[in-house]
Interface confidence: low
């Protein structure tokens, strides 16, 4: 049994890091493998992660971490029984994938303005709370070409757009994702999408 593709890990910078790797053949990850991880720190203890299958030869493990700070460094040991298959290390702050924003809501009761709001996925005491920026994706269910991205570079989790920038009388969907420049993170997954019917009063035509 050998590791074909070494584990790569990403952290949500809160409580979970996810490591994925590939074996050289079909593997029952949960019965055959264990990923041991330990914070490089005097009083830390080794923890064991039981991996799950992720495709025939792929494995994924969700590492639980108490709290993550920028200096944290973990040793990783991948075992098959008594055989050490791979040894490495992982610094969560250097491989951050933020949590996806939640509770995306479209408020259509503001005159001719669409207000999109969502929730910051981090608690206020987490470092990323004040460092997230967002991308909002809006698209038409009827017209695949009507697809747009709005970059929200301020901290407030909201976006206002004029309803007239979208077509009237049709349905739209929106979703939002986050990233943090401070840790050069990857983008989060998209939030669940929300749907609304866009309608607004056309201004009187000028003759």
């Amino acid at each position: 049994m050998k590791v074909l593709q070494e584990p790569t890990c990403v952290s949500d910078y809160m409580s979970i890091s996810t490591c994925e790797w590939k074996m050289n053949g079909p593997t029952n990850c949960s019965t055959e493998l264990r990923l041991l991880y330990q914070l490089v720190f005097l009083l830390s203890e080794a923890h064991t992660c039981i991996p799950e299958n992720n495709g025939g030869a792929g494995c994924v493990c969700h590492l639980l971490m108490d709290d993550v700070v920028s200096a944290d460094n973990y040793t990783l040991d991948l075992w098959a029984g008594q055989q050490l298959l791979w040894k490495g290390s992982f610094k969560p702050s250097e491989h951050v994938k933020p949590r996806a924003p939640g509770n995306l809501t479209v408020h259509t009761n503001v005159s001719d303005t669409l207000l999109l709001t969502w929730s910051n996925p981090y608690p206020p005491d987490n470092y990323l709370y004040n460092h997230l920026t967002y991308a909002v994706n809006i698209w038409s269910e009827n017209d695949p070409a009507d697809f747009r991205i709005y970059n929200v570079t301020y901290l407030e989790p909201s976006l206002r757009i004029a309803a007239s920038t979208l077509k009237s009388g049709i349905s739209y969907r929106a979703r939002v994702r986050a990233w943090a420049q401070c840790y050069n993170t990857t983008w989060s997954e998209w939030s669940p999408s929300t749907k609304w019917h866009n309608s607004y009063r056309e201004p009187f035509e000028q003759h």
Partner: antibody, heavy 120, light 107 residues
């Protein structure tokens, strides 16, 4: 404001005992790793002992192992160092520090220190 | 035990000078190195953690770098209030160990 206030130091004869206390305030003591660091007169810093947040894991430098005991009372926000079989070489200023805090491995908060003199 | 060899043990510099202190570990300690400042009669203060991260509230003239076995602490422009002894500290190996200190004086 974060404060660590040590007490319990003093003059003690070789072979004697002392109990140092460190009263913590201004941060969440119960979730913080804590440690004791000492500094002999005119010398550098020496790591003495550490304890995890719930008191379940402890660490001792070889020089104090078997003689010193670190403990904590999270209900009182207090860290302790029970020192026995004291030797002349234990003479030092003892600092209470927050060991892990927000930065692993770094002692971000230090007390003002309490002086221990072992002499006959 | 991992030895942290700090040099120089003392140095004298003028206000405005760039000051560099080095610390060499006897074996690889990754980036698990911290730098402290201790003024006479006072307790140490954290300046740099994880080899290169500036601690909250510490002036930007202080910086740290390095990984593995060689580490550097720099004051870009020495100020009168920087007179102190500086210590490096590794927490990668057990027991955690400190460098012998560098006493910094103003010329």
């Amino acid at each position: 404001e974060v404060q660590l206030v040590e007490s319990g130091g003093g003059l003690v004869q070789p072979g004697g005992s002392l109990r140092l206390s460190c009263a913590a305030s201004g941060f969440t003591f119960s979730s913080s790793y804590m440690s004791w660091v000492r500094q002999a007169p005119g010398k550098g810093l020496e790591y003495v002992s550490a304890i995890n947040s719930n008191g379940g894991k402890t660490y001792y430098a070889d020089s104090v192992k078997g003689r010193f005991t670190i403990s904590r009372d999270n209900s009182k926000n207090t860290l302790y160092l029970q020192m026995s079989s004291l030797r002349a070489e234990d003479t030092a200023v003892y600092y209470c520090t927050r060991q892990r805090g927000n930065y692993v491995g770094a002692m971000d908060y230090w007390g003002q220190g309490t002086s221990v003199t072992v002499s006959s | 035990d991992i030895q942290m060899t700090q040099s120089p043990s003392s140095l004298s510099a003028s206000v405005g000078d760039r000051v560099t202190i080095t610390c060499q570990a006897s074996q690889d300690v990754s980036t698990a190195v911290v730098w402290y400042q201790q003024k006479p009669g006072k307790s140490p203060k954290l300046l740099i953690y994880s080899a290169s991260y500036l601690y909250t509230g510490v002036p930007s003239r202080f910086s740290g770098s390095g990984s593995g076995t060689d580490f550097t602490f720099t004051i870009s422009s020495l100020q009168p209030e920087d007179i102190a002894t500086y210590y490096c500290h590794q927490y990668y190996g057990s027991p955690p160990t400190f460098g012998g200190g560098t006493k910094l004086e103003i010329k």
